[in-house]
């Protein structure tokens, strides 16, 4: 069976194909590689001559025992290897060599005892190791380590690392890797020599299920003493052995340890009063909790130094009361409990997540809400009723606003978004809005990408809504039971390039609404009922136009729209998709693709 | 259609085909068994997967006596720090594990309960495996 | 500049309803922020009563839950108190304010004294 | 309901003394409180919110320090105009509360 061409010439999928031996009838530029889950079971030397070019190489359980010097020797532009799964027992000193641009290198799972006797420290180019899932017991990192001055990733997660010494990491003292994330989840830690990452510099430290009991997590956060990481992961896996206890102590010793992010990522154990908890963790730039459960979050200090609050996939008992002066970012998206918004007090925001929460909000959108007048990122999607009370005073240096999936309530009965001219997005999709005031986008004169897919109009008649929005791109009306619309509604947006009217009820096409649009590149009206066209004479199209979707509609294929089916082959040239485009009627024509029609058609006297 | 036996319990039986063509190997093993009426046990699934499984989801299609419910998505591994170690798991990795789970109070009527579980993972987006569960209920009289 | 100016009767007599206006300039109520009743009892301490929020939505003191009403007038930018049944611990000066995101009171009304008394 | 007690409730003080109020929650506020001063006949005066942060146009004499359950108003020169009553109000929950009050009296 032969490998399948995914881009010709350049990438091959071979995966699972019971090959025993590399393939030789593929061409040499082939770039990228796919041998997974083949018997390979032996990799001689010069493997890969017929592949010279190669840069992505994935070798993922192919029952690899033995690799020989020079296995790789031809792949000089080699960038990623990937020997996952792989029960090897014997691999060459040479084993990696002629690997000059090799940047990642994966051996997770594949027998792997020692980082020792490991044959990479010619490897200058390696950005990424991954040899988790192993059989490590040293966290000693060898010598040629030094050689290694372009590594940004090593995980060792999975592996049977029980201490760290101080002489583990002396090769990181005599050259300090800057940017080096290092990944110790899942080893059974029970001891980490105080001292041993002191003057260490890290860019990511994780240690998730390491401990498996509160003293010993105590220690070895201890152990860590005088290390500085930009960004500590701390926390458990939900699949795997957790902590029984968890208290204030657990995270005492990270007063000693000079952190710019922290994140505590899942913990099974119920959290009533965090504020002792996180006490080392005032002057963090940057802070995350991820699945945890929290009984209330009311005592964060406003003075706390945090520029970026993560709470993500978290259980509260109420909405958190968050006052925190130098907070320029909140992330709260998917938490469960709180379903009440409650006024925030973050003077400094400027970007501001809370989707997902199934939220409702009594009134919305007043600075007097988030306590900020800077904020310029707002997205309040997937919650639940919105009661939009406000025109969002105080809050005119907003450019980003997303309601979409939420129940927006009061929509219709002022100009809700009258002080926002700085805004560029705005999604509005399935809010369960239904359209009746004219003036329901006034003032938004810089806006450029506006959806609203999925919502209604009164009377299913689309009005002169747009008047104001002169620098509109994007307009997205689909899923809005449209029947009509006012032949001037788009008269104003001279710079849309994308108009999406599909999954409307429109039984008629006409041109001219679409006169003034000089920059239209886009035009969806798929799975609408066109049958016809509004007028005998259909004009063209701006000249800009460059797609014209009309597939999924109801074409009707007879005599007396023959102007219509031939104005549309006509267009033939912007249509998109056309096999999908087929007559709906007469019966005996339903299913034929309209463009392959030739009607001809007689008057009959 | 090779079906493949889960378990039984006092007021259920749990088998499952696959509803893909590739018909990966998974091991699923639950104790103790499911009871639909309240239950609390383990789940152990051994897995060697043909994806990375980054990004993991699945998509639930489930069916109440012939009664089509709407379609389910449920994130398992968001992409980064996620809740469940196998979400760091690559292919060609093993994936060996278990996950408790518990549930109580919710009555079930008697009958057939399909579900057809679509795994996907990865960027870009792919199936990993498809999975037919099939549920027969029977009540306790007690 | 925001501005609070509280109006009303000066004398309620015991079991009547006792009613109050705050009338506001320079800032809309309906723009933003909660309007809230505070009184203070002659020589006494302060005592929160309740608020109106902009969007409409209204709490209360317990303490005076079952006797407490605020409402507003968005026409003319005014919210206003009743308070009913009242008794002799009732008369104190009657202040509107509102209140910051902080939950503290940086604008508050003059004050009006209403004394209950036949 | 969170309890807030002020001490002492009258103090009678020199002109360029120092001056200590003090305010005790009922239970961890973090800090969440404020501090304002009023005088006879007029409204209360927003001074310090959030424990230590002092509002735009309030003398640089006036500070404040605490976080949890106990905290400190501190008048460091205090000056005749300085006579007032002043309070305490915590922002922590609901229903909002205020302390008792202390008195300033220059001697």
């Known amino acids: 069976e032969p490998c399948v061409e995914v881009v010709p010439n350049i990438t091959y999928q071979c995966m699972e194909l019971n090959f025993y031996k590399i393939p030789d009838n593929l061409p040499f530029s082939t770039k990228n590689l796919d041998l997974s889950f083949n018997p390979l079971r032996h990799l001689g030397s010069y493997s890969f001559f017929s592949f010279p070019e190669l840069q992505v190489l994935d070798l993922s359980r192919c029952e690899i025992q033995t690799i020989e010097d020079g296995a790789y020797q031809s792949l000089s532009h080699l960038s990623t290897l990937i020997l996952t799964g792989n029960p090897i027992q014997s691999l060459a000193l040479g084993a990696f060599s002629g690997l000059s641009s090799l940047q990642k290198l994966v051996a997770v799972e594949t027998n792997l005892a020692s980082l020792e006797n490991f044959p990479i420290g010619h490897l200058k180019t390696l950005k990424e190791l991954n040899v988790a899932h192993n059989l490590i017991q040293s966290f000693k990192l060898p010598e040629y380590f030094s050689n290694l001055t372009n590594l940004e990733h090593l995980d060792l997660s999975s592996n049977k690392i029980q201490s760290i010494y101080c002489t583990d990491l002396r090769v990181l003292h005599q050259m300090p890797l800057l940017n080096l994330s290092l990944d110790l989840s899942l080893n059974p830690m029970n001891f980490i020599q105080p001292g041993a990452f002191k003057e260490i510099r890290l860019h990511k430290l994780t240690l998730r299920n390491n401990f498996d009991s509160l003293n010993v997590m105590k220690t070895c956060i201890q152990g860590l003493a005088g290390l500085e990481v930009h960004r500590l992961v701390l926390g458990e896996f939900r699949n795997e052995g957790n902590l029984e206890k968890f208290d204030k102590s657990a995270l005492e010793g990270l007063c000693n340890l000079t952190i710019e992010e922290f994140r505590l990522a899942y913990l099974d154990y119920y959290l009533d009063d965090i504020i002792d908890l996180f006490n080392c963790l005032t002057n963090v730039s940057s802070f995350s909790l991820v699945s945890v459960t929290i009984e209330r979050v009311k005592d964060f200090s406003y003075n706390f130094g945090w520029q970026h609050l993560e709470l993500v996939n978290c259980k509260f008992g109420q909405f958190p009361t968050l006052k925190l002066k130098s907070l320029k970012r909140l992330t709260f998206t998917s938490n469960k409990g709180g379903n009440a918004f409650s006024e925030v007090d973050l003077p400094s925001l400027e970007f501001l997540d809370l989707s997902r929460n199934g939220l409702s909000f009594k009134g919305c959108c007043s600075q007097s809400d988030f306590g900020t007048t800077s904020l310029k990122y707002l997205d309040l999607s997937f919650n639940g009723v919105i009661t939009m009370s406000s025109n969002f005073l105080g809050l005119e240096q907003l450019e980003h606003l997303d309601f979409q999936h939420s129940n927006l309530k009061q929509m219709s009965e002022f100009s809700v978004f009258l002080s926002l001219r700085n805004l560029i997005y705005l999604d509005i999709s399935h809010t369960h809005t239904r359209v009746a005031f004219n003036g329901i986008f006034n003032g938004l004169s810089s806006l450029e990408v506006l959806k609203m897919a999925g919502n209604s109009f009164q009377e299913n008649f689309l009005p002169d809504i747009f008047t104001e929005l002169r620098n509109l791109t994007f307009l997205d009306l689909s899923q809005c039971q449209l029947e009509q619309l006012s032949p001037t509604a788009f008269n104003s947006l001279s710079s849309l390039q994308v108009l999406n009217m599909s999954h409307n009820n429109f039984f008629s096409l006409d041109t001219f609404p679409y006169k003034c649009l000089n920059s239209l590149q886009v035009l969806d009206y798929s799975l609408n009922h066109i049958m016809t066209s509004k007028k005998q004479e259909l004009q063209h199209f701006p000249s800009s136009l460059a797609f014209l979707n009309l597939t999924q509609n109801d074409f009707a294929c007879t005599c007396e729209h023959q102007s219509f089916l031939q104005w549309i082959k006509d267009q033939r040239q912007l249509l998109v998709e056309v096999e999908r485009m087929e007559c709906a009627t007469p019966s005996d024509k339903q299913g034929m693709p309209v463009l392959s029609l030739n009607i001809t058609c007689q008057m009959n006297k | 259609q090779k079906q493949y036996w889960v378990c039984n319990s006092s007021d259920a039986s749990i088998s499952y085909t696959y509803c893909d063509k590739m018909q990966y190997p998974i091991s699923i093993n639950v104790n103790p068994c499911i009871e639909l009426k309240r239950s609390k046990g383990l789940l152990h699934i051994f897995y060697i997967p043909r994806r990375d499984l980054k990004q993991l989801y699945f998509n639930l299609y489930i069916t109440v006596n012939t009664m089509n419910l709407p379609k389910r998505k449920e994130v398992i591994c968001r992409g980064s720090d996620d809740d469940y170690s196998f979400c760091r798991a690559l292919k060609g990795e093993t994936v060996n594990t278990t996950i408790s789970f518990s549930f109580k109070g919710i009555k079930f009527s008697k009958g057939k309960y399909k579900c057809v579980v679509e795994a996907i993972s990865g960027s870009p987006e792919e199936m990993l495996f498809c999975l037919e569960f099939v549920i027969l209920h029977q009540p306790n009289s007690n | 500049q925001v501005q609070l100016q509280e109006s009303g009767p000066g004398l309620v007599k015991p079991s009547d309803t006792l009613s109050l206006t705050c009338a506001v300039s320079?800032?809309?109520?309906?723009?933003?922020?909660?309007w809230h009743w505070i009184r203070q009892p002659p020589g006494k301490g302060l005592e929160w009563m309740g608020y109106i929020h902009y969007s409409g939505y209204t709490d209360f003191n317990p303490s005076l839950k079952t006797r407490i009403t605020i409402s507003r007038d968005t026409s003319k930018n005014q919210f206003s108190l009743k308070l009913s049944s009242v008794t002799a611990v009732d008369t104190a000066v009657y202040y509107c304010?509102?209140?910051?995101?902080?939950?503290?009171?940086?604008?508050w009304g003059q004050g009006t004294l209403v004394t209950v008394s036949s | 309901e969170i309890v807030l007690t002020q001490s002492p409730d009258f103090q009678s003080v020199t002109p360029k003394e120092k001056v200590t109020i003090t305010c005790r929650a009922s239970?961890?506020?973090?800090?969440?409180l404020h501090w304002y001063q009023q005088k006879p006949d007029q409204s209360p005066k927003l001074l310090i919110k959030?424990?230590?942060h002092a509002i735009s146009g309030v003398p640089s004499r006036f500070s404040g320090s605490g976080s949890g359950t106990d905290f400190t108003l501190t008048i460091n020169s205090l000056e005749a105009e300085d006579a007032a009553t002043y309070y305490c109000?915590?922002?922590?929950?609901?229903?909002?509360?205020f302390g008792g009050g202390t008195k300033v009296e220059i001697k």
């Open positions: 109000q915590q922002g922590h929950s609901f229903p909002l509360t």
């Open positions: 959030y424990a230590s």
């Open positions: 304010a509102r209140k910051d995101p902080s939950d503290a009171f940086p604008y």
């Open positions: 239970q961890s506020i973090s800090d969440h």
């Open positions: 320079g800032y809309s109520i309906t723009g933003g922020y909660s």
